[in-house]
């Protein structure tokens, strides 16, 4: 990674020049699928990808106003095994439904300290944050 | 989204106070799986999730030094249909291997313009960037 400075002093830049992060991110789901009670361990024939998958999942919100992005969504598998392609409901023990994880780059808003210890606006601290993206139907791992 | 200013003036803050984004992100794959020729349309019984999936995929690097994160990985499906759980190699036409997309928050480094048009360091411009996260085995959509 090349280095960028990440501090934003609160003064010294005209406020009208500031770019505002006001775009609303599109969650990778329909809001209804956030509700655990509206989904079950079955593969639908319509709807979003997470409900048509044979390893279906729901999304759970992770919100922190001092982080960018402020809203993240974590996948939660609805079935331990994969759903049969034939029926869309019965589970097939030959396949496991496993979470796919990803270390996402996020930025935290932190107070900045000046040379004399006084506050100088805020800093953006870059971190890696583990999120589960989806559930994937996999063949069970065979131990050698 | 709540609003944060996103400009980072290049002056006015002690350089030793700047946080440096030097952490290297862990890609969600082994480098070998970036090579298209080293993988094929089959579900492995070991290795990373993307090779054990019955909707296997490889990753392609997307690098932009003026973007944070600088490195993004796009999934590319290796099969049009899902691989049979039984054999791990033959395709099952009852299931489609579909890309899961996500609008990820990224930040572009842009020059900032002062009141008189002169450059004042750089600004971080927040954007949504479409990435493919994984390939998912789904039941084909039935049109009503």
């Amino acid at each position: 990674y090349s280095h960028w400075p990440s501090c934003c002093p609160s003064k010294g830049y005209p406020s009208e020049e500031l770019l505002r992060w006001s775009t609303v991110p599109v969650p990778p789901l329909k809001p209804a699928s956030l509700d655990f009670h509206s989904v079950s361990c079955r593969a639908s024939e319509d709807g979003p990808l997470n409900s048509r998958a044979i390893s279906p999942w729901r999304y759970e919100l992770d919100r922190d106003l001092n982080r960018l992005p402020q809203d993240l969504y974590h996948a939660r598998c609805l079935c331990p095994h994969c759903v049969s392609l034939q029926t869309g409901s019965h589970m097939d023990p030959r396949g496991n439904s496993e979470l796919l994880y990803h270390n996402q780059t996020v930025f935290y808003r932190r107070p900045c300290h000046g040379k004399k210890g006084n506050h100088k606006g805020y800093c953006l601290e870059r971190r890696l944050y583990r999120v589960s993206l989806a559930c994937v139907c996999v063949r069970p791992r065979v131990m050698g | 989204y709540s609003h944060w200013p996103s400009c980072c003036p290049s002056k006015g803050y002690p350089s030793e106070e700047l946080l440096r984004w030097s952490t290297v992100p862990v890609p969600p794959l082994k480098p070998a799986s970036l090579d298209f020729h080293s993988v094929s349309c089959r579900a492995s019984e070991d290795g990373p999730l993307n090779s054990r999936a019955i909707s296997p995929w490889r990753y392609e690097l997307d690098r932009d030094l003026n973007r944070l994160p600088q490195d993004l990985y796009h999934a590319r499906c290796l099969c049009p249909h899902c691989v049979s759980l039984q054999t791990g190699s033959h395709m099952d036409p009852r299931g489609n291997s579909e890309l899961l997309y996500h609008n990820q928050t990224v930040f572009y480094r842009r020059p900032c313009h002062g009141k008189k048009g002169n450059h004042k360091g750089y600004c971080l411009e927040r954007r949504l960037y479409r990435v493919s996260l994984a390939c998912v085995c789904v039941r084909p959509r039935v049109m009503g």
């Epitope: 609160s10 006001s22 609303v24 759970e60 919100l61 992770d62 919100r63 922190d64 106003l65 001092n66 982080r67 993240l72 974590h74 808003r109 932190r110 107070p111 506050h119 606006g121 805020y122 | 989204y1 709540s2 609003h3």
Partner: antibody
């Protein structure tokens, strides 16, 4: 100045639905980063967070009570509502509404910075 | 879900005595918030973000801590400090606010 005031039925019977209203002034719940929550306190006991609603209508509930709780808001009348289904004697408490959304130079605080005076609810047969 | 455990549950202190109230989290957290509540009144925010005193809070109060261990300290107990103190945190996933069980501080 910021004020919040809770209102409720006072007394209700087991299995009924409790409806609470929080009327507020001095701030707008449509302001980015603003939120309002409900907290209850049985007599002589501690504080228990129940539910929260954000400026963008995103809602959160205490997991153990999620199936019984519903929070909503009416921006035009500056009110937030909480309903608790199938109440029991264990739901007897003082119910508070409180604001969250204080923005400092370093970011948002997740403390409830303004509270109502509370409304007493008794569930009794 | 993170659990907050306050200790002691009840304590008494003489005027001028140093008082420390502890709050332990079941897993690591970034910040802790504290409230003061007196009988018949609503809770008042007392300490923000671990160590920042709310407006009007006397300078004899301080907050500190990190990870799983946080504390509120009164350098010199006064009669008006007799109250119940609660610690509180926000957890982003799943989004929940959690309160400690409270510490009732009495004056001797």
């Amino acid at each position: 100045q910021v004020t919040l005031k809770e209102s409720g039925p006072g007394i209700l019977q087991p299995s009924q639905t409790l409806s609470l209203t929080c009327s507020f002034s001095g701030f707008s719940l449509s302001t980015s980063g603003m939120g309002l929550g409900w907290i209850r306190q049985p007599s002589g006991k501690g504080l228990e967070w129940l539910a929260h609603i954000w400026w963008d209508d995103v809602k959160h509930y205490k997991p153990a009570l999620k199936s019984r709780l519903t929070i909503s808001k009416d921006i035009s009348s500056s009110q937030v509502f909480l309903t608790i289904a199938s109440v029991d004697t264990a739901d007897t408490a003082t119910y508070y509404c409180a604001r969250m959304g204080q923005l400092h130079y370093y970011g948002y605080d997740y403390a409830m910075d303004y509270w109502g005076q509370g409304t007493s609810v008794t569930v009794s047969s | 879900q993170i659990v907050l455990t306050q200790s002691p549950a009840i304590m008494s202190a003489s005027p001028g005595e140093k008082v420390t109230i502890s709050c332990s989290a079941s897993s690591s957290v970034s910040y802790m918030y504290w409230y003061q509540q007196k009988p018949g009144s609503s809770p008042k925010p007392w300490i923000y973000r671990t160590s920042n005193l709310a407006s009007g809070v006397p300078a004899r109060f301080s907050g500190s801590g990190s990870g799983t261990s946080y504390s509120l300290t009164i350098s010199s107990m006064e009669a008006e400090d007799a109250a119940t103190y609660y610690c509180q945190l926000y957890h982003s996933y799943p989004p929940t606010w959690t309160f400690g069980g409270g510490t009732k501080l009495e004056i001797k």
